[in-house]
């Protein structure tokens, strides 16, 4: 008597998530009498996938009619495949008895599920950094299979090379995750810059997924300060200007000090944007020279984006101002203690 063979012709089958998978199995003989059962996995922890005799298997249907006389084809179709269905499936022949006795197993068919990666999510640093500093951006995508995946980083369309990528887990799994961290050196011109994380996978048919992050969320461009004096007005008032230029973000507080005492505080708001995304702001202070006997030390103090204040001082020489109207002014910028603290 020829020994019964259980034939699973495919060693592996790959199916896209959502599709149906056909797992083929034929037997070489009609005897001995007994059922075929399908299992996922082997050993005591194996899961029963299909048993014609009993049980409810809504997603599994036999390919051919198993009740038909002389049927030797016990292939099954599993509908609406998900990554959780991945594994090795065994077609197992039992001999009829009480209970049925396991007789022979097929060699197994490994089902792998092709699943698309999720849209890449790019996150930037928690705190802003200034130009010339390096910041890290992280890109994450999940739920894809198979494991092979390509990830690229771009800054304003130019490919970046300083990044590190990990795909987890290392071994075989139903689905995988990718995490990549790119290091980007900031420049003062990066307010309008963008980093893009691009993920390519076999399931995407050459149309990669992209995640973006704006460098405007990561950068701080500290202001330049310049204090200048306009010519004396007819009413003995000197107009002193503090020009705050090329800063980002807009969050800025400017305080005028006269001889160390707070004269006025202003908050920047609704400023027009420069082409490069930075902002400028000009503040004026009128000083009544006739009200002072000595020189007046004016300080423009700027606190930008919660950083330590930056000062620029300027001395108005009272002695140099004759009291008659229309005379020229002689002003001297004494305070060059500008501090840019990052």
């Amino acid at each position: 008597e020829e020994e019964l063979q259980v034939i699973q012709p495919e060693k592996s089958v790959s199916v896209a998530a959502g599709d149906s998978a056909t797992l083929n199995c034929t037997v070489s003989s009609l005897i001995p009498v007994g059922p075929i059962q399908w299992f996922r996995g082997a050993g005591p922890g194996r899961e029963l996938i299909y048993n014609l005799k009993e049980g409810h298997f809504p997603r599994v249907t036999p390919v051919s009619d198993p009740t038909k006389r002389n049927n030797m084809d016990f292939s099954i179709r599993i509908s609406n495949i998900t990554p959780a269905d991945a594994g090795t499936y065994y077609c197992v022949k039992f001999r009829k008895g009480s209970p049925d006795v396991e007789l022979k197993s097929g060699a197994g068919t490994e089902l792998s599920v092709r699943a698309k990666p999720s849209a890449p999510v790019v996150s930037g640093p928690a705190v802003r950094a200034t130009a010339e500093h390096t910041v890290s951006f992280t890109c994450e995508s999940h739920g894809f299979s198979p494991r092979d995946i390509t990830l690229k980083w771009f800054k304003n369309g130019n490919e970046l090379s300083d990044f590190q990528t990990n795909v987890d887990p290392a071994g075989k799994s139903v689905s995988y995750s990718i995490r990549s961290t790119a290091r980007v050196v900031l420049t003062r011109r990066d307010v309008h810059s963008q980093v893009i994380c691009e993920v390519a996978h076999v399931t995407l048919q050459g149309d990669p997924l992209r995640g973006t992050a704006n460098l405007s969320e990561a950068i701080r461009v500290p202001p330049f300060l310049e204090v200048t004096q306009q010519s004396m007005r007819a009413d003995n008032q000197v107009n002193v200007t503090c020009q705050v230029t090329k800063f980002y973000p807009q969050r800025l507080q400017l305080t005028w000090l006269e001889n160390g005492n707070v004269s006025r505080t202003e908050m920047a708001s609704a400023l027009p944007e420069n082409k490069d995304g930075t902002y400028n702001w000009t503040s004026w202070l009128l000083v009544n020279v006739s009200a002072h006997r000595d020189d007046v030390k004016l300080t423009c103090q700027v606190e930008h984006d919660g950083q330590p204040a930056v000062n620029k001082s300027f001395s108005v020489k009272v002695s140099a101002h004759p009291k008659e109207q229309g005379s020229n002014t002689a002003a001297e910028n004494t305070g060059t203690n500008e501090r840019n603290i990052y």
């Epitope: 082997a42 050993g43 005591p44 922890g45 887990p169 075989k172």
Partner: antibody, heavy 122, light 112 residues
């Protein structure tokens, strides 16, 4: 080449919980059983239990009420927790991989960790 | 539970000579599929056990061919055709047919 590495405290007080982790490197968690086996000083091998990659667990009946084996596929790790330990639980604890190709049985414990000595003492 | 019994428990050997260890199970390890769920392990001094034989007679990867396993049902034998000095240690048989997995008491092989 698959390697297994046990980690966890070497000394546990009586009545406390023993916690060990086994890290799988160079291979996959899938399609295998992941086992804990112990060996008391000068004695033979005692199977504690194992977990299949699908999460199904099997335990030694005498230890079942005290033992939990869990799997973290994202970290390629599996763990053993044993509550209410006594001096009788002092042993070298091995994590190991058990193969299963087809059928109901298993095909040998083919990869073993180097073992970690756990002493139960106050 | 399936009880595994080994004999002898101690085996003095001479390098170059053959040696054999017996193992008996309390119930048959020959499954209906024709597969025998019996494994042999060697634990060298200070080391973890290593798989020598699985399925009653199949040599594990990297195991020298001087080791062979035989038997079926409840009686099994591990043979070493020519003992080498590196073969010293404790040999265990183990069944993998059903949980709990069980092992024999071990046979200590030492050079005479």
């Amino acid at each position: 080449q698959v390697q297994l590495q046990e980690s966890g405290p070497g000394l546990v007080k009586p009545s406390e919980t023993l916690s060990l982790t086994c890290t799988v490197s160079g291979g996959s968690i899938r399609d295998y059983y992941w086992s804990w086996i112990r060996q008391p000083p000068g004695k033979g091998l005692e199977w504690i239990g194992f977990i299949y990659y699908n999460g199904r667990t099997f335990y030694q009946s005498s230890l079942k009420s005290r033992v939990t084996i869990s799997l973290d596929t994202s970290k390629n790790q599996f763990s053993l927790k044993m509550t209410s330990v006594t001096a009788a639980d002092t042993a070298v604890y091995y994590c190991a991989r058990v193969r299963a190709y087809s059928g109901i049985g298993l095909d040998g414990t083919d990869v073993w960790g180097q073992g970690t000595t756990v002493t139960v003492s106050s | 539970d399936i009880v595994m019994t080994q004999s002898p428990l101690s085996l003095p050997v001479t390098p170059g000579e053959p040696a054999s260890i017996s193992c008996r199970s309390s119930q048959s390890l020959l499954y209906s599929t024709g597969y025998t769920y019996l494994d042999w392990y060697l634990q060298r001094p200070g080391q973890s056990p290593q798989l020598l034989i699985y399925g009653g007679s199949s040599r594990a990867s990297g195991v020298p061919d001087r080791f062979s396993g035989s038997g079926s049902g409840t009686d099994f034998t591990l043979k070493i055709s020519r003992v080498e000095a590196e073969d010293v240690g404790v040999f265990y048989c183990g069944q993998a047919l059903q949980t709990p997995l069980t092992f024999g008491q071990g046979t200590k092989v030492e050079i005479k």
